[in-house]
């Protein structure tokens, strides 16, 4: 296992539809056909995967159908956007990319991305 | 090395509005936030909100939305704040300072002081 | 919101002696919570984040510690150039808030 350089930005703000998009960014060193990559999520010391997908190089990420993450990739970038997120969901999005094939195995784990989420304000009831 | 240079004291009238602005140089400016702070003289400090310079997006103090806005320029990497309807009670020390990775206020500006006064 | 309460608002203390200063919130925030330093005409200073870790530059006699609603910021040593305004401040969630200060003067 090599060790590989992952940037992400430190915080961003989600939208009031409680949506995130960030970019991962990753300095491969080598040419990877196959590429993982995995949103984990710290909170409290406590880390749980968001999401994961595996793709290969010049193709679309898929998460599986019930994943809230989507994303797209353009070389050693990869534009990820997390969905349905809600003040309680605010904690730090740790972008870990791992260079499958082929060999020799590299991880890198970025710093993380703080996200900070605002439950929308509820809108008042209209009468008709 | 990190810094935050505020733009200039203002004097306004009540009514008014007032734009100041906040350049920041020395790291990646869209990876960080900017928040604005205030402090009314001898009182405490008073967050107004902050914007995400990655994606615009802003959160408000409730007590001052509809007549604040926060924007950047990341081509220049300067964040503005915009308050109107200025009132007496808007004078005060404004300062940004840069949102780090636990929300900390990692660097500050030097502040821009808002005199209103009829 | 969550609202954060200081104790004391002003404290009068001799060099060298110990400074205790607490930090209180309305509901459990974990370790989101900052300490900064003003002195007179000065803008803050970020003195510890998240809850108890030092920054660079800042001198070894400050440190923070608690979590979840209680926290403190001690000051061992005091020294004359503490003489300063202390805030600390929530990130745990949105709005982000102020306590309302802790006056520190020498005597």
């Known amino acids: 296992c090599k060790a590989m350089h992952v940037a992400q930005p430190a915080v961003v703000l989600a939208s009031s539809r409680g949506i995130a998009s960030f970019v991962c960014e990753y300095a491969s060193p080598g040419k990877a056909t196959e590429v993982r990559v995995t949103v984990l999520r710290q909170a409290d010391s406590q880390v749980t995967e968001v999401c994961a997908a595996t793709y290969m190089m010049g193709n679309e990420l898929t998460f599986l159908d019930d994943s809230i993450c989507t994303g797209t990739s353009s070389g050693n970038q990869v534009n990820l956007t997390i969905q349905g997120l809600r003040a309680m969901d605010t904690g730090l999005y740790i972008c870990k990319v791992e260079l499958m094939y082929p060999p020799p195995y590299y991880l890198g784990i970025g710093n993380g991305t703080q996200i900070y989420v605002i439950d929308p304000e509820p809108c008042p009831d209209s009468d008709f | 090395q990190v810094q935050l240079v505020q733009s200039g004291a203002e004097v306004k009238k009540p009514g008014a509005s007032v734009k100041v602005s906040c350049k920041a140089s020395g790291y990646t400016f869209t990876s960080y936030g900017i928040s604005w702070v205030r402090q009314a003289p001898g009182q405490g400090l008073e967050c107004m909100g902050w914007?995400?310079?990655?994606?615009?997006?802003?959160n408000y103090a409730q007590k001052l939305q509809g007549r604040v806005t926060m924007t950047t320029d990341t081509s220049t990497s300067t964040a503005y704040m915009e308050l109107r309807s200025l009132r007496s009670d808007d004078t005060a020390v404004y300062y940004c300072?840069?949102?780090?990775?636990?929300?900390?206020?990692?660097?500050w500006g030097q502040g821009t002081l808002v005199t209103v006064s009829s | 919101e969550i609202v954060l309460t200081q104790s004391p608002d002003f404290q009068s203390v001799t060099p060298k002696e110990k400074v205790t200063i607490t930090c209180r919130a309305s509901q459990s925030i974990g370790s989101s919570l900052h300490w900064y330093q003003q002195k007179p005409d000065q803008s803050p200073k970020l003195l510890i984040k998240?809850?108890?870790q030092s920054i660079s530059g800042v001198p070894s006699r400050f440190s923070g510690s608690g979590s979840g609603t209680d926290f403190t910021l001690t000051i061992n040593s005091l020294e004359a150039e503490d003489a300063a305004a202390y805030y600390c401040h929530q990130s745990s969630s949105l709005p982000f808030t102020f306590g309302p200060g802790t006056k520190v003067d020498i005597k």
């Open positions: 914007i995400s310079a990655y994606n615009g997006n802003t």
């Open positions: 998240y809850a108890s």
């Open positions: 300072a840069r949102v780090g990775r636990f929300g900390e206020f990692d660097y």
